[in-house]
Interface confidence: low
């Protein structure tokens, strides 16, 4: 199947630059005076609207209105062509992309305007491609697609499991929901035998057991983000500090080498990512503790960059696993720390999973193709892709995304493989709540 | 255009270098494949270079005989140990470029004929 | 080593027919995989790229599908023009080496 929407793939051209240039608005960054307390809640609001309007900006003039395929051509500036265009072979002209054919959907110094996605059978096209919008395709009704298995549409489930109410309906992009009729958790299992399966229509509504579940999520939710305001005032803050670098002030890498419409998640998503990581307190389902934590932690409790995605889901704050944070243990530059370390990776990761591992983690799919023309030899391909990462994100690619991105895709033990190897090597220890001293 | 060169008459055993030659495009920017038939045979893959890096695939049966390389405007096609099975017209092949493999451009082929 | 199994080896059909050819995978390669029409003494010429989408001016009437490892080719109303050898090239770019592999041809014969 082809690439679709945040995945859409880039052409080559074999240049350097394939993000997209200084005109990609990036969002307003809070400045150095902004109190501390207030940055966790305008980061979060910064995210939505810069969301918004990132859908919003992307607007496509009619085809009528354009000129004909090929035959527009204007000068580039600083040496990028607008979306909709591509540069030419001596890099004097923007060319027009094809309407319905091809589009590019940032400033750009691509040799080629980016393919269209065809919509597979068992897909709907909700928007045709234009000269600056990728196709987008959707599951048809009855069905839905997973991030983790993007490459086709899944029959959504008929019901909940015996004991279990429905809360969301089958979504193009969901299965149905469930949660137990108690607690209002979650129900994160497998998909349930026909016999314990308890059927609902699509509109049924959740019942007022689960809506004060619900309601009761929000409400944790909301003190959780409370008690982080007054967490970032205390001790720990100046502990934190170091490590994050400016980060609640705007700083870290350039965002504008960061190309939003690939990067999962977004470089201003890890930075909210990384603070929520080291605020937020979860809990850790009993039947994942084996897996998941190899010592018990005695300082800080954290909540992963992935699972901190899902911060305004309060049901979703029930599958959250306890993190603690990996920080290099000479106080080294992280992301350099983490490259010394992918040397490794290669036999931790199980190789079918590098290609998902690596558009998990936001290279497109020319990227990869090139990385692995790129690397020496079989072994050294997923090395080449994740430098080509690293490159690619700059500061933004962190441990925590990394780790993330294997537990998205279900790769628990080459995650905790991988934890172990950042301990074992003495390159990251745990950040401690009161101590310095590392735990393996 | 793409255009191979190179191709002769020679006997097994003597070394050849094959010649890819571009006009109205950089080389560096490709993906570059050699392709040869053999006469009144299919299209058999012989490997490719990602001209930006340099990097270099080979299929299994070339089994180091042949090596390919480039400069800033062709690829060559080096080949040693030659034998009679390695008669055939050998073309070059330009992929577009774009996230899929799509061998849009091609040369027109130059003959090697290996024989005693 | 990937192996394409190109089916069948000749095929005719008189003008306005259709011609299915069908090559299989050894293994999976997504929609890796793309179409080559040749004319003697000519190079191969690009028809189907990622199983399914046309090249630039190539005539609507060739198609290109996929199921799971297997790929098809389609030609409605062929024409005399469309007389050629027909191949397909699969890739599994994932492995270095035998990554490339064309299936054995297809002579198309029209009547």
């Known amino acids: 199947m082809e690439q679709r929407g945040q995945n859409a793939p880039a052409a080559s051209g074999a240049r350097k630059r394939h993000g997209p240039g200084p005109r990609e608005a990036r969002g307003a960054r809070p400045g150095p005076r902004v109190p501390k307390t207030l940055v966790l809640v305008v980061a979060a609001v910064l995210l939505l609207v810069s969301a918004e309007s990132a859908l919003i900006t992307q607007q496509d003039l009619a085809p009528q209105q354009r000129a004909a395929p090929q035959q527009k051509r204007s000068s580039p500036s600083e040496g990028l062509c607008p979306p909709g265009h591509h540069i030419s072979e001596d890099g004097r002209d923007c060319i027009s992309c094809k309407y319905g054919q091809d589009y590019s959907t940032h400033w750009n110094d691509l040799l080629f305007c980016l393919r269209c996605t065809r919509c597979d059978s068992g897909e709907v096209e909700l928007s045709p491609c234009t000269t600056t919008r990728n196709t987008v395709c959707q599951c048809e009704e009855g069905t839905f697609r997973e991030e983790d298995s993007p490459e086709m549409c899944r029959k959504c489930r008929t019901g909940c499991p015996r004991g279990m109410v429905k809360v969301g309906d089958c979504t193009p992009w969901s299965d149905i929901e469930c949660v137990h009729k108690e607690s209002g958790t979650k129900h994160s299992g497998e998909v349930p035998a026909v016999e314990e399966t308890v059927t609902s229509s699509p509109g049924t509504p959740a019942s007022p057991c689960s809506l004060s579940g619900i309601i009761i999520g929000v409400t944790v939710a909301a003190v959780v983000l409370i008690v982080a305001v007054f967490v970032c005032k205390s001790l720990l803050w100046k502990k934190v500090l170091p490590y994050l670098k400016g980060i609640c002030s705007g700083g870290g890498g350039d965002p504008e080498r960061v190309d939003r419409s690939s990067q999962r998640p977004g470089a201003e998503d890890n930075v909210l990512n990384e603070i929520v990581s080291i605020l937020q307190p979860t809990q850790v389902p009993e039947q994942e503790m084996e897996v998941q934590e190899p010592a018990e932690p005695t300082g800080v409790n954290m909540l992963s960059p992935g699972e901190s995605e899902h911060l305004l889901e309060p049901a979703e704050a029930e599958r959250s696993q306890r993190r603690r944070l990996l920080v290099p243990a000479n106080e080294g530059d992280p992301t350099e720390t983490l490259r010394q370390c992918f040397d490794d990776f290669a036999d931790l990761v199980p190789f079918d999973s590098w290609e998902p591992l690596m558009r998990k983690l936001g290279l497109m799919d020319n990227e990869i193709k090139v990385a692995k023309a790129e690397a020496a030899g079989h072994r050294d391909t997923l090395y080449t892709m994740l430098i080509k990462w690293v490159n690619k994100t700059g500061r933004d690619a962190s441990v925590h995304t990394l780790l993330d991105a294997l537990e998205t895709l279900g790769e628990r033990l080459a995650k905790q493989k991988i934890e172990d190897h950042l301990l074992s090597s003495g390159k990251f220890m745990y950040l401690e709540g009161n101590a310095d001293s590392a735990m393996s | 255009s793409l255009e191979e060169s190179g191709g002769r008459l020679v006997t097994p055993g003597t070394p050849l270098t094959l010649t890819c030659t571009a006009s109205?495009?950089?080389?560096?920017?490709?993906?570059m494949s050699w392709v040869r038939q053999a006469p009144g045979k299919g299209l058999e893959w012989i490997g490719y270079?990602?001209?930006?890096?340099?990097s270099t695939w080979y299929a299994s049966w070339v089994k180091g005989r042949f090596t390919i390389s480039k400069t800033s405007t062709t690829v060559d096609l080096k080949m040693t140990s030659l034998t009679t099975e390695d008669t055939a017209t050998y073309f070059c092949?330009?992929?577009?470029?774009?996230?899929?493999?799509?061998?849009?451009?091609w040369g027109p082929g130059t003959l090697v004929t290996v024989s005693s | 080593a990937l192996v394409m199994t190109q089916t069948p080896s000749s095929t005719s059909e008189p003008v306005g027919g259709t011609v299915t050819i069908k090559c299989q995978a050894s293994?999976?390669?997504?929609?890796?995989l793309s179409w080559y029409q040749q004319t003697p003494g000519q190079p191969p010429k690009l028809l189907i790229y990622?199983?399914?989408s046309l090249a630039s001016s190539v005539p609507k009437r060739f198609s290109g599908s996929r199921s799971g490892t297997q790929f098809t080719l389609t030609i409605s109303g062929v024409q005399c023009a469309d007389a050629a050898t027909y191949y397909c090239?699969?890739?599994?770019?994932?492995?270095?080496?035998?990554?490339?592999?064309f299936g054995g041809g297809t002579e198309v014969v029209v009547k």
């Open positions: 092949a330009r992929d577009a470029g774009s996230s899929y493999w799509e061998f849009n451009l």
């Open positions: 109205g495009f950089t080389i560096s920017s490709y993906h």
């Open positions: 270079i990602y001209a930006g890096s340099a």
């Open positions: 293994q999976s390669i997504g929609s890796s």
């Open positions: 990622t199983a399914s």
């Open positions: 090239l699969g890739i599994d770019d994932v492995r270095r080496d035998d990554g490339f592999a």
